[in-house]
Interface confidence: medium
Amino acid sequence: IWSAVFLNSLFNQEVQIPLTESYCGPCPKNWICYKNNCYQFFDESKNWYESQASCMSQNASLLKVYSKEDQDLLKLVKSYHWMGLVHIPTNGSWQWEDGSILSPNLLTIIEMQKGDCALYASSFKGYIENCSTPNTYICMQRTV
């Protein structure tokens, strides 16, 4: 059973969110559950490090984009939010918090500013930003 939920502050249009935990989850209370992932959008602006710490305090991590199919709701996300992607100057690569390398097919990286962190924006785009700049952020928890 699916419910068409219009989350005006987060998404550009209607998104399908499951009604019952038996189809998805479990997730922390008031988090969005979608295709075996739990998401929460935090409105308070923090720098990347503070955002990471906030997610960790809730047994989650900053958003990791790993599948366009499983995370298709991210196509519709409004605005810019910190995700768990950082640039490693020593080897030049973009890495997720867990150390895995960004696959180029998942995100289009756009050099908006000089920096070593990235903001997620709609349609699978990542915008380079200074890690100390305050921004809203997305936490994610895998359920499987």
Epitope: K68, E69, K75, H87, N91, G92, S93, I101, S103, P104, N105, T108, E111, S123
Partner: antibody, heavy 117, light 107 residues
Amino acid sequence: QVQLVQSGAEVKKPGASVKVSCKASGYTFTSYWMNWVRQAPGQGLEWMGRIDPYDSETHYNQKFQGRVTMTVDKSTSTAYMELSSLRSEDTAVYYCAKMGDYSFDYWGQGTLVTVSS
Amino acid sequence: DIQLTQSPSSLSASVGDRVTITCRASGNIHNYLAWYQQKPGKSPKVLVYNAKTLADGVPSRFSGSGSGTDYTLTISSLQPEDFATYYCQHFWSTPWTFGGGTKVEIK
């Protein structure tokens, strides 16, 4: 195994358009960007642009903006590249190439497009 | 746009020689560089990506190195099948330009 099979050679007149196809197999078509690269006779490689088969988002090399159109047919796992207003300088071998880990890991066999009056 | 300058544009070498090809970028490309080999009438084949990671099935005599704006492809001991044209390509910001190529010929 991954395969990219392109359409056959074409001869076109200046001002005409050409549409080259690239049929993909052996992998999940929607999970990897498809790129188009051309190579004029005896010359180097030139990136024309890419398309994301997942949502058809395109990114074209500014040099070809307005003349090139990249599309996909997800039902047949086929990518297309159409180049319009052809001129003699467009005579080249056109390749489709699958995006890998920051490289083009698989290439089509190439399609020779000859523009001649 | 980032420009890639390859040198030399051509070189003559013998089987067993150590061959070095360089690729200089007009700006920092942060190791987002690939190397390809192309033989006449054939499609290019990737050898190295992320500046130094060897692609699957590529012999260990090929290696990539460099950082920032300067990158190198090295063939430690040239084999008969290595005579070809080599191209570098960056993936830092579009357009993803290629170098002009280096033709490796038999001396």
